[in-house]
């Protein structure tokens, strides 16, 4: 369906409000350091141009691609060279190379100040004074900090953000109403960003086939009553949506996502019985709801897979005729029977099956060769089951904070070269798997835990890719997408690591720690723990626990003291000396 003017087509499909919001997100995700006002100006210029094209699709430049139009606009930024350095070189390239160049310069960890939440009254005044600017600012700040955030989903977050302020700014107790809602949006937003980052990494680093395999497995678990052909169609459409969003084609992505939601709702009878409520909602809520919908019940009767995938004399013939279709059917049939497995486990099983067929279909007696293929699945299934059982027991014994600390020590010993902030952030998130997943019954634990861990380990991978410091991290991140977690789990203490020089400054604390929130205080303590392990990687659990207990007591004592700063200075020296002695430094 070729349109004379792509920009006019998208403007008409999406409407002015969504068009402007998506262009702002796109620009902020590309030029993450540009001031808000500059972006608003660029967006307004693009919007005015789009309107001229809606009026007359034959008008000058209206036939240009969106990449060309947006790229040209970004390249008009006067401070491009001094703000972004070599990214300015992208502007010398032609499309599509220019867009690829912009994509490569997206920064997962931009050097931006932490977002500080103003007082509730200040926020409510700003919201009432200029609602439109207030909401645009939200889109801008999230998009520039999360350059792969799923744009149509960010529109949904913005809608909820607006609803929170509309409701709470007229409540009797504004803070009690608003702050929990903002906390929820922040936490959900971070989770949404990380999930989408994994999808983009899957597409960009491992290709469309890897993403499609993931989608077949997940959609087959979610829609076990749908036919394979239906799942395949949904996978194709979903792949297109995510390829577009990950590629910066946000207008096309949002448009296609809306079309996909419409298709799913029009065909829900042949997809899932769980979609009814979702499909009654407005567009943004509908798309979000479909993406989060619970798994449908399995069909009443499903035969053993053995007949079609092991015992049939046509296994090798079917495989040879259309390898990916046959493997897709295997994955579909396996996944719809196993909502209790993680997607990554299902993909490992499919890979094992593929490897077996590759080997056996070339053998003298193929059937004899692959007859026991499902026996090879047993250890693959039991490994995550056992790991989750052990870690949930540890979590239940320790609680979240101490469980995070156990993981901090474990991962710092595995990859001590990784920066301390990254180790703290990743280990804290790994530790959240306990409260997120261990409460579930066994049948839901593995999909919850292992698929969540895949998301968190991808954060480690993308942060490490920016400044690679560990061959072991590079190896686990790049060899196999589905084996990342087992790869990291299998890492032992890095014996090649030369311990870091002791630096007293790292363990010097000040009275400002007393005014921090509980979460920020935990991060301070966990930062110190990582540094301790980097200084003394062979320290035992008991030694580290003793030092951390002393540290907690020291902070508590000095925060109660009248002269806090003096206490931190004097007691701090004693603590450092005692810690050095305890660890044999």
């Amino acid at each position: 369906d070729a349109h004379k003017s792509e920009v006019a087509h998208r403007f008409k499909d999406l409407g002015e409000e969504n068009f402007k919001a998506l262009v702002l997100i796109a620009f902020a995700q590309y030029l993450q350091q540009c001031p808000f006002e500059d972006h608003v100006k660029l967006v307004n210029e693009v919007t005015e141009f789009a309107k001229t094209c809606v009026a007359d699709e034959s008008a000058e430049n209206c036939d240009k691609s969106l990449h060309t139009l947006f790229g040209d606009k970004l390249c008009t930024v006067a401070t491009l060279r001094e703000t972004y350095g070599e990214m300015a070189d992208c502007c010398a390239k032609q499309e599509p190379e220019r867009n690829e160049c912009f994509l490569q310069h997206k920064d997962d960890n931009p050097n931006l100040p932490r977002l500080v939440r103003p007082e509730v009254d200040v926020m409510c005044t700003a919201f009432h004074d200029n609602e439109e600017t207030f909401l645009k600012k939200y889109l801008y700040e999230i998009a520039r900090r999360h350059p792969y955030f799923y744009a149509p989903e960010l529109l949904f977050f913005a809608k909820r953000y607006k609803a929170a302020f509309t409701e709470c700014c007229q409540a009797a107790d504004k803070a009690a109403c608003l702050l929990p809602k903002l906390d929820e949006l922040r936490d959900e937003g971070k989770a949404s960003s990380a999930k989408q980052r994994l999808k983009c990494a899957s597409l960009q680093k491992f290709g469309e086939r890897a993403f499609k395999a993931w989608a077949v497995a997940r959609l087959s678990q979610r829609f076990p009553k749908a036919e394979f052909a239906e799942v395949s169609k949904l996978v194709t459409d979903l792949t297109k949506v995510h390829t577009e969003c990950c590629h910066g084609d946000l207008l096309e992505c949002a448009d296609d996502r809306a079309d996909l939601a419409k298709y799913i709702c029009e065909n829900q009878d042949s997809i899932s019985s769980k979609l009814k409520e979702c499909c009654e909602k407005p567009l943004l809520e509908k798309s979000h709801c479909i993406a989060e919908v619970e798994n449908d019940e399995m069909p009443a009767d499903l035969p053993s897979l053995a007949a079609d995938f092991v015992e049939s004399k046509d296994v090798c013939k079917n495989y040879a005729e259309a390898k990916d279709v046959f493997l897709g059917m295997f994955l579909y049939e396996y996944a719809r029977r196993h909502p209790d497995y993680s997607v990554v486990l299902l993909l490992r099983l499919a890979k094992t099956y593929e490897t077996t067929l590759e080997k056996c279909c070339a053998a003298a007696d193929p059937h004899e060769c692959y007859a026991k293929v499902f026996d090879e699945f047993k250890p693959l299934v039991e490994e995550p089951q056992n790991l989750i059982k052990q870690n949930c027991e540890l979590f239940e014994q320790l609680g979240e904070y101490k469980f995070q600390n156990a993981l901090l020590v474990r991962y710092t010993k595995k990859v001590p070269q990784v920066s301390t902030p990254t180790l703290v952030e990743v280990s804290r998130n790994l530790g959240k798997v306990g409260s997120k997943c261990c409460k579930h019954p066994e049948a839901k634990r593995m999909p919850c835990a292992e698929d969540y861990l895949s998301v968190v380990l991808n954060q480690l991978c993308v942060l490490h890719e920016k400044t690679p410091v560990s061959d072991r991290v590079t190896k686990c991140c790049t060899e196999s997408l589905v084996n990342r977690r087992p790869c990291f789990s299998a890492l032992e203490v890095d014996e090649t690591y030369v311990p870091k020089e002791f630096n007293a400054e790292t363990f010097t604390f000040h009275a400002d720690i007393c005014t921090l929130s509980e979460k920020e205080r935990q991060i301070k303590k966990q930062t110190a723990l990582v540094e301790l392990v980097k200084h003394k990687p062979k320290a035992t659990k008991e030694q580290l626990k003793a030092v951390m207990d002393d540290f907690a007591a020291f902070v508590e004592k000095c925060c109660k003291a009248d002269d806090k700063e003096t206490c931190f200075a004097e007691e701090g020296k004693k603590l450092v000396a005692a810690s050095q002695a305890a660890l044999g430094l």
Partner: nanobody, 124 residues
Framework: DVQLVESGGGVVQPGGSLRLSCAAS????????MGWFRRAPGKEREFVAA????????YYADSVKGRFTISRDNSKKTAYLQMNSLRPEDTALYYC?????????????????WGQGTLVTVSS
């Protein structure tokens, strides 16, 4: 949770028949694949037969095909194993198992609940 209790085992001559029953208590068994496994003295546990949730599909080990028949009555929360033309090599402790999710039917790791077993001895 599901508790499973097997019955019907005993001593029988070669060529004879037995009918094993597996009674479930707790959950409704209609959402579980039901299977029978056995362990002969000094051997590994092996798959015998399994039946899909509503009974539409059955699956057998090659060694028992044509001799054993698995069935179920969901209203009675019971699964059965009719064993005909018994042989000495069928001597084993027979276990009933229930699997909420099962792709292969024959894999013990896909079953969540197990009975204590009932002994079948085939001897002249």
């Amino acid at each position: 949770d599901v508790q499973l209790v097997e019955s019907g085992g005993g001593v029988v001559q070669p060529g004879g028949s037995l009918r094993l029953s597996c009674a479930a208590s707790g959950s409704n068994i209609s959402s579980y694949v039901m299977g029978w496994f056995r362990r002969a003295p000094g051997k590994e546990r092996e798959f015998v037969a399994a039946i899909s949730r509503s009974g539409g599909y059955t699956y057998y080990a090659d060694s028992v095909k044509g001799r054993f028949t698995i069935s179920r009555d969901n209203s009675k929360k019971t699964a059965y194993l009719q064993m005909n033309s018994l042989r000495p090599e069928d001597t084993a402790l027979y276990y009933c198992a229930a699997g909420r999710y099962s792709a292969w039917y024959s894999q013990s790791y896909e079953y969540d609940y197990w009975g204590q077993g009932t002994l079948v001895t085939v001897s002249s």
